[in-house]
């Protein structure tokens, strides 16, 4: 006999990372029928949904209207349907930014080089954080980690065009508090013709919305927009 | 922006009863899941019961759970929390919370953790003694 139900599915609309002060929606879906569900912050209840009417709805949303670094942190979601509860669904990390100050992101040897080169990304914070991050626009899985006491070297190595794109860099004061995004800087590599349309397999943010890290919501999207979420926010454990 | 004031506290006795009222002001109240939290001397503050902006839905702690009643009213900007059978553990200061005003929150939710309130009240202290 079935002792638990499958899992929800949880994500953040527009985006996990969230700038202070924004709003931000968790979204928590499970199955038709769910009479309850319930959004877990850092291992404590934080919100109960008793959808009505419960056949009709498998999703819920979390409003969080003003973000800021106490929301910031790990949530997770389960639901129950009759007196049967389901497991937990992955942990969703909400990240804030905006945080304090800019980091400066350059790039070494320059912004064109030319494929299989070697080429360094630094990230510089002069105030009081030692972990970076690298992002690059588009899959949110490509993130990278890196320390140090002012700076972070982020070695891509010998870079193909697949390398190309824009990238920015955060300091993060602990996982969920980032500062404010750098300036971004666009990698040319040889051999790449420009394209700012939506590539299938390196789906991109649209320039003019990084800064508030908007993805496109449509209804067919959102699971993939959580996936590739949660792909970066291991990256964050 | 929102003001919260609570008011009908005092003293108790083992058993006996209470009705607390938040009085708001502010035009979006009817729209804003509330909630009642207590923080008893020397203690941390503690959730107690909550309804969504409809008073469709209600979440109590457990230890409220069939002794505590929580509703609002819409058209006074009111809510209430109806407290029975009293116990010498219930004696704290009871505040009034509601969340920020800035999202459409669904009918049917509410939020049981401090951290999701932008405005509170300035308290009512409950005392239950004989």
């Known amino acids: 006999q079935q002792q638990t139900l499958p899992k929800p599915f949880i994500w953040a609309e527009p985006h996990f990372m969230v700038p202070k002060e924004k709003q931000v929606t968790i979204c928590c879906q499970g199955n038709y029928g769910a009479v309850e569900y319930q959004l877990h912050f850092e291992g404590s209840l934080f919100a109960v949904d008793r959808p009505k009417p419960p056949e009709r709805i498998n999703k819920v949303q979390f409003y969080i209207p003003d973000m800021n670094s106490r929301m910031a942190g790990q949530y997770s979601c389960i639901y129950r349907v009759g007196e049967l509860w389901s497991e937990p669904s992955n942990l969703l990390d909400l990240v804030v930014t905006e945080m304090y100050d800019t980091p400066t992101l350059s790039v070494h040897p320059g912004p064109e080089v030319i494929s299989g080169e070697k080429v360094t990304f630094y990230c510089r914070l002069d105030t009081a954080t030692s972990m970076f991050l690298l992002l690059k626009e588009g899959r949110s899985s490509h993130v990278q980690r890196g320390y140090g006491k002012v700076q972070a070297e982020f070695p891509l190595g010998p870079v193909t065009t697949a390398h190309r794109g824009t990238y920015r860099c955060f300091g993060s004061y602990n996982n969920h508090a980032w500062s404010f995004p750098s300036e971004p800087v666009k990698l040319l590599v040889t051999g790449d013709i420009e394209n700012t349309s939506l590539a299938p397999e390196d789906p991109t943010f649209p320039a003019d919305t990084w800064g508030t890290y908007l993805l496109t919501t449509e209804t067919g999207l959102q699971k993939d927009h959580a996936l590739w979420d949660h792909t970066a926010q291991n990256l964050l454990r | 922006e929102v003001q919260l004031v609570e008011s009908g506290g005092g003293l108790v006795q083992p058993g006996g009863s209470l009705r607390l009222s938040c009085a708001a002001s502010g035009r979006t109240f009817s729209r804003l899941p509330m909630a009642w939290f207590r923080q008893a001397p020397g203690k941390d503050r503690e959730f107690v019961a909550a309804i969504s902006w409809s008073g469709g839905s209600t979440y109590y702690a457990d230890s409220m759970k069939g002794r505590f009643t929580i509703s609002r009213d819409n058209s006074k900007n009111t809510a209430y929390l109806q407290m029975n059978s009293l116990r010498a553990e219930d004696t704290a200061v009871y505040y009034c919370?509601?969340?920020?005003?800035?999202?459409?929150?669904?009918?049917?939710?509410?939020?049981?953790?401090?951290?999701?309130?932008?405005?509170w009240g300035q308290g009512t202290l409950v005392t239950v003694s004989s």
């Open positions: 919370a509601a969340v920020g005003d800035s999202a459409p929150y669904s009918a049917t939710i509410v939020y049981t953790d401090a951290r999701a309130y932008a405005y």
